[in-house]
């Protein structure tokens, strides 16, 4: 004998209390596939989460993070505090990037400035806490015969405190 529950479409559940009638999922629950004997409880976007997509009878709710936070993990399973550009999040909160590193986003870690000399180039624009250095032509390209619209800015000397 065929199981009548297999006829129940997504958005419903097979209600054994009512002779295997397909009943619609109650509010705040869903079934994404047919033939289910129960509906799944919808995710609730509370606290640092906010609702990006309300739960429907066939699909779960989707969450975002409230202002000042950003999503981490699959399906925004966590919210992490934003920092300012030029900072990174540590266990003690947002901290300025150390000299020689930068972060141009509100999330993530401070990364070292590009080492222009590794590519045989010179520093055209100094790095900051918020921006990477800009590499320019190699010193050889800047011989007296070569024209250069912008002379290279001098590299920052080590030991200077962050701006």
């Amino acid at each position: 004998l065929q199981d009548l529950c297999s006829n129940c479409p997504a958005g419903t559940f097979c209600d054994n209390n009512r002779s295997q009638i397909c009943s619609p999922c109650p509010p705040n629950s869903f079934s994404s596939a047919g033939g289910q004997r129960t509906c799944d409880i919808c995710r609730q976007c509370k606290g640092v989460f906010k609702t990006r997509k309300e739960c429907s009878s066939t699909s779960n709710a989707e969450c975002d993070c409230i202002s000042g936070y950003h999503c981490l993990g699959a399906e925004c399973s966590m919210c992490e505090q934003d920092c300012k550009q030029g900072q990174e999040l540590t266990k003690k909160g947002c901290k300025d990037c150390c000299f020689g590193t930068f972060n141009d986003q509100k999330r993530g870690i401070c990364r070292p400035w590009t080492n222009c000399s590794l590519d045989g180039k010179s520093v055209l624009v100094n790095g900051t806490k918020e921006r990477d250095v800009v590499c320019g032509p190699s010193p050889a390209d800047l011989s007296p015969g070569a024209s250069s619209a912008t002379p290279p800015a001098p590299a920052r000397e080590p030991g200077h405190s962050p701006q």
Partner: antibody
Framework: QVQLQQSGAELTRPGASVKLSCKAS????????IQWIKQRPGQGLEWIGT????????RYTQKFKGKATLTADKSSSTAYMQLSSLASEDSAVYYC??????????WGQGTTLTVSS | DILLTQSPAILSVSPGERVSFSCRAS??????IHWYQQRTNGSPRLLIK???ESISGIPSRFSGSGSGTDFTLTINSVESEDIADYYC?????????FGGGTKLEMK
């Protein structure tokens, strides 16, 4: 910002049908339930039904099954409610509202329907 | 269907008083109750969701409590701008429904 703009006042004859609209803006239309609510003069709020625009899923209260038909046009981000076989007791203000499960955070300004011969 | 009963139908208060609105469900609905305010000739606005959760932009004098079948909306110090009708709505089961409302008046 989120807005629900409802169609203008309607004056219709008994027995006729009318289609009220609710144009959504400022958010992803398909992501939230749209509720429809009736309020007769001097009376309370009466829930008619709701539609989920993404898949057209609808729910009605028993009283309005056969009276109200909810639809949604994703291309224009507009929800509609058609009311049929109109009678004087259908004269009311009709509201659309965005959101259901966490309450209706946003409401339209309401459409006044007058049914008179 | 779940029936929501609001009481009293009319509440008369003086400015600065603490006032409570009752909403009773005919069967248990967990915390799936939401409260709305409707001023004269205006659209309703959401005050409280899920019985006790605050809504951004709503003054802190509004609070909610309760679970199961008995719910309360409280205004801890009424102001003249609070004169309005107040409604509860359940979203625990289909069809969702509103209570009959309570009118808040000034003495």
């Amino acid at each position: 910002q989120v807005q629900l703009q409802q169609s203008g006042a309607e004056l219709t004859r008994p027995g006729a049908s009318v289609k009220l609209s609710c144009k959504a803006s400022g958010y992803t239309f398909t992501n939230y339930w749209i509720q429809w609510i009736k309020q007769r003069p001097g009376q309370g709020l009466e829930w008619i039904g709701t539609i989920y625009p993404e898949n057209g899923d609808t729910r009605y209260t028993q009283k309005f099954k056969g009276k109200a038909t909810l639809t949604a046009d994703k291309s224009s981000s507009t929800a509609y409610m058609q009311l049929s076989s109109l009678a004087s007791e259908d004269s009311a203000v009709y509201y659309c509202a965005r959101g259901l499960l966490e309450g209706a955070h946003y409401w339209g300004q309401g459409t006044t329907l007058t049914v008179s011969s | 269907d779940i029936l929501l009963t609001q009481s009293p139908a009319i509440l008369s208060v003086s400015p600065g008083e603490r006032v409570s609105f009752s909403c009773r469900a005919s069967q248990s609905i967990g915390a799936s109750i939401h409260w709305y305010q409707q001023r004269t000739n205006g659209s309703p606005r959401l005050l409280i969701k899920f019985s006790s959760e605050s809504i951004s932009g709503i003054p802190s004098r509004f609070s909610g409590s309760g679970s199961g079948t008995d719910f309360t909306l409280t205004i801890n110090s009424v102001e003249s701008e609070d004169i309005a009708d107040y409604y509860c709505q359940q979203t625990n089961s289909w069809p969702t429904a509103f209570g009959g409302g309570t009118k808040l008046e000034m003495k």
